[in-house]
Interface confidence: low
Amino acid sequence: EVEKTACPSGKKAREIDESLIFYKKWELEACVDAALLATQMDRVNAIPFTYEQLDVLKHKLDELYPQGYPESVIQHLGYLFLKMSPEDIRKWNVTSLETLKALLEVNKGHEMSPQVATLIDRFVKGRGQLDKDTLDTLTAFYPGYLCSLSPEELSSVPPSSIWAVRPQDLDTCDPRQLDVLYPKARLAFQNMNGSEYFVKIQSFLGGAPTEDLKALSQQNVSMDLATFMKLRTDAVLPLTVAEVQKLLGPHVEGLKAEERHRPVRDWILRQRQDDLDTLGLGLQG
């Protein structure tokens, strides 16, 4: 907390500029008008303030806006955002995607902090759903963002937003999350032709039921083993040897290397040995 002291003669700030970096903390407190700071926030980032000086500037804004900063100020916080606590951010009403992008840019390259998590939470709740533009933005900054949402939260993602999802965005999703996302993806991509559809739906197949895998096996999709290994065990078990052979195409030989791992191991145990022998891979049921 900075003591209230009178501003020395001639030091009253007329604008936010480089001269302020030479002000002591108490001088910043006494000589910088909070309203001036709020209107010239965009200049703060161009000035090499110390973290201690930024603390004073934050304190001034907190006094000016005890109920939370307006978006016009938030959008230009820049590095001052790193000084905000989740409690500060919970008071904000952020509605502009440009504001969100500006603040995510400040934190770029860092782990998702509690501050960023709170900011995203406020923004998404304010919008009511994860629309495509928001999802595009969030996954660009945090590829794992989608998989950090609970299945309940994912259920509010509209199918149209699925177009923004890249395969790497789903790398860390667990089966229950894919269970929610898969039907949305199927809906989103339903008008695509066979080969294009498979390219798009492939990353979501960890949530696919048996009947969809059976349908895919009729499409000459040549699923790779990495995708097959991510399928739900309960969805793979009912597939026949012929269906798995059609589903994998030339990749069927890869089953041998994975015979001790789920879901391949469990699937093998469900098959008749005669059927397995038709693959010529030496798989033992």
């Epitope: 989740p86 782990e111 998702m112 509690p114 998590a117 709170t118 939470d121 945090y142 794992g144 963002y145 998989c147 950090s148 949402l149 609970s150 299945p151 939260e153 860390t172 999703c173 667990d174 229950r176 999350q177």
Partner: nanobody
Framework: QVQLVESGGGSVQAGGSLRLSCAAS????????MGWFRQAPGKERERVAQ???????TYADSVKGRFTIARDDAENTLYLQMNSLKPEDTAMYSC??????????????WGQGTQVTVSS
């Protein structure tokens, strides 16, 4: 429905040990990030330790070297081994589970908590 049930709390003398457990249902402990928080009467909730999906662990400075967080994937349970306990460790300890790689704050799911009391 996700449920987290803590156990293992109790009263202990300073210097003693306790092992807290958090049994999860409807949630796979290896699928996301999990953590332990504590709250003493009249104090704010404090993050004690957390373990990421990749099993990376982090601790509050006040418990480093004394507490160990671990999970047992087979038992689907999170643990907090607390050694060299001090009176200031007295609090209600709650486990929390997050979805995904980010330990978003606050936790997505909370247990009811288990009381730990350390007397001098």
């Amino acid at each position: 429905q996700v449920q987290l049930v803590e156990s293992g709390g109790g009263s202990v003398q300073a210097g003693g040990s306790l092992r807290l457990s958090c049994a999860a249902s409807g949630y796979t402990v290896s699928s996301g990030c999990m953590g332990w928080f504590r709250q003493a009467p009249g104090k704010e909730r404090e993050r004690v330790a957390q373990i990421g999906r990749d099993a990376t662990t982090t601790y509050a400075d006040s418990v480093k070297g004394r507490f160990t967080i671990a999970r047992d994937d087979a038992e689907n349970t999170l643990y907090l081994q607390m050694n060299s306990l001090k009176p200031e460790d007295t609090a209600m300890y709650s486990c929390t589970a997050y979805w995904g790689v980010y330990c978003l704050s606050p936790g997505r799911y909370w247990g009811q908590g288990t009381q730990v009391t350390v007397s001098s």
